[in-house]
Interface confidence: low
């Protein structure tokens, strides 16, 4: 495929990545699927700088990111190593809380109103952020 060298319309460029910020809410799986259909993925936070950038754009609103533990260990959707990577959990989180009465624990991570992370029920309809890297090969077929 062709390399993407600039961000799509309505996406924001930062440090060689493009970001799209939703203004509506979806369950985590639906948000994940939305980003994939855009040839992107839910945002993967790898540094304080990226954390602050995303935080600035989403404001004090619960917002899904590309981090989940639905299959056991915490995993980033793009394969970034969780154990050695950047983390910004609220103290006492993640807690896989079962007390919400919605069945199961809490398997999906989101930015809270102050930017720090919490795990929550994946079915909650939160806003989300998609990310795609510039210079990566696009999945679109080349024009003939």
């Amino acid at each position: 495929g062709s390399e993407r060298t600039c961000c799509p319309v309505n996406w924001v460029e930062h440090e060689r990545s493009c970001y799209w910020f939703s203004r509506s809410g979806k369950a985590w799986a639906d948000a994940d699927n939305y980003c994939r259909l855009e040839d992107a993925h839910l945002v993967v936070v790898t540094s304080w700088e990226e954390q602050k950038f995303v935080q600035h754009h989403i404001g004090p609103v619960n917002t899904w990111m590309g981090l989940h533990d639905q299959n056991g260990p915490w995993k980033w959707v793009d394969g970034t190593d969780y154990e050695t990577g950047f983390k910004n959990w609220r103290p006492e989180q993640p807690d896989d809380w079962y007390g919400h009465g919605l069945g199961g624990g809490e398997d999906c991570a989101h930015f809270t109103d102050d930017g720090r992370w919490n795990d929550d029920v994946c079915q909650r309809p939160y806003r989300w952020v998609c990310e795609t890297e510039l210079d990566k090969a696009s999945q679109e077929p080349p024009l003939l």
């Epitope: 304080w48 935080q55 950047f86 910004n88 103290p91 006492e92 109103d113 102050d114 930017g115 720090r116």
Partner: antibody, heavy 119, light 107 residues
């Protein structure tokens, strides 16, 4: 500019109570988690308690759990520390501090108020 | 609880000296390490957050490094106003904990 001004300190007998206040100005108080940190005379800093921006969560150091209560009134831009069953070892300068919005570190501090617990 | 061990507890240095203070955490705290300066009778001032990020308004002679369990605060060229006590603090989990402090005195 950001200002935090503590008040309410003084001399109190062991077992008695005291309430500290911290008046905040120069920023949107309701957006920030707030903390109390204390410093015994000639000693180092000890974190005491935190309250989240909306008051929904509170955490304490073990030595004050069940005796101290942190609270806030966002309509008055004021943070409080209710201290009950005071002990001699609670004698310290008490600082209120604003946490940065991305992590539990303190970017602004008050000038402190001295609490002396003595019979 | 996470214990923070600072060393040395005090040091004597001269204006212009390079000063290094170390802080060790009892467990991995990633980059959740902050440094403060406190002068007698005054409130603490934030110098460094997230192990190596300089707080706004802090002179560039202050720098921080490290991650995991071992961290360092360096003052590249000590100035008269730098004589104070320095504290590290972990912001990884509650209870938040401080190191015991390092007093930097005039030689």
């Amino acid at each position: 500019q950001v200002q935090l001004v503590e008040s309410g300190g003084g001399v109190v007998q062991p077992g008695r109570s005291l309430r500290l206040s911290c008046a905040a100005s120069g920023f949107t108080f309701s957006y920030y988690g707030m903390h109390w940190v204390r410093q015994a005379p000639g000693k180092g800093l000890e974190w005491v308690a935190v309250i989240w921006h909306d008051g929904s969560n509170k955490y304490y150091v073990d030595s004050v759990k069940g005796r101290f209560t942190i609270s806030r009134d966002n309509s008055k831009n004021t943070l409080y520390l209710q201290m009950n069953s005071l002990r001699a070892e609670d004698t310290a300068v008490y600082y209120c501090a604003r946490e940065n919005s991305s992590s539990y570190y303190f970017d602004y501090w008050g000038q402190g108020t001295l609490v002396t617990v003595s019979s | 609880d996470i214990q923070m061990t600072q060393s040395p507890s005090s040091l004597s240095a001269s204006v212009g000296d390079r000063v290094t203070i170390t802080c060790r955490a009892s467990q991995n705290i990633y980059s959740y390490l902050n440094w403060y300066q406190q002068k007698p009778g005054k409130d603490p001032k934030l110098l460094i957050y997230a192990a190596s990020s300089l707080h706004s308004g802090v002179p560039s002679r202050f720098s921080g490094s490290g991650s995991g369990t071992d961290f360092t605060l360096t003052i590249s060229s000590l100035q008269p106003e730098d004589f104070a006590t320095y504290y590290c603090q972990q912001s990884y989990s509650t209870p938040l904990t401080f190191g015991g402090g390092t007093k930097v005195e005039i030689k």
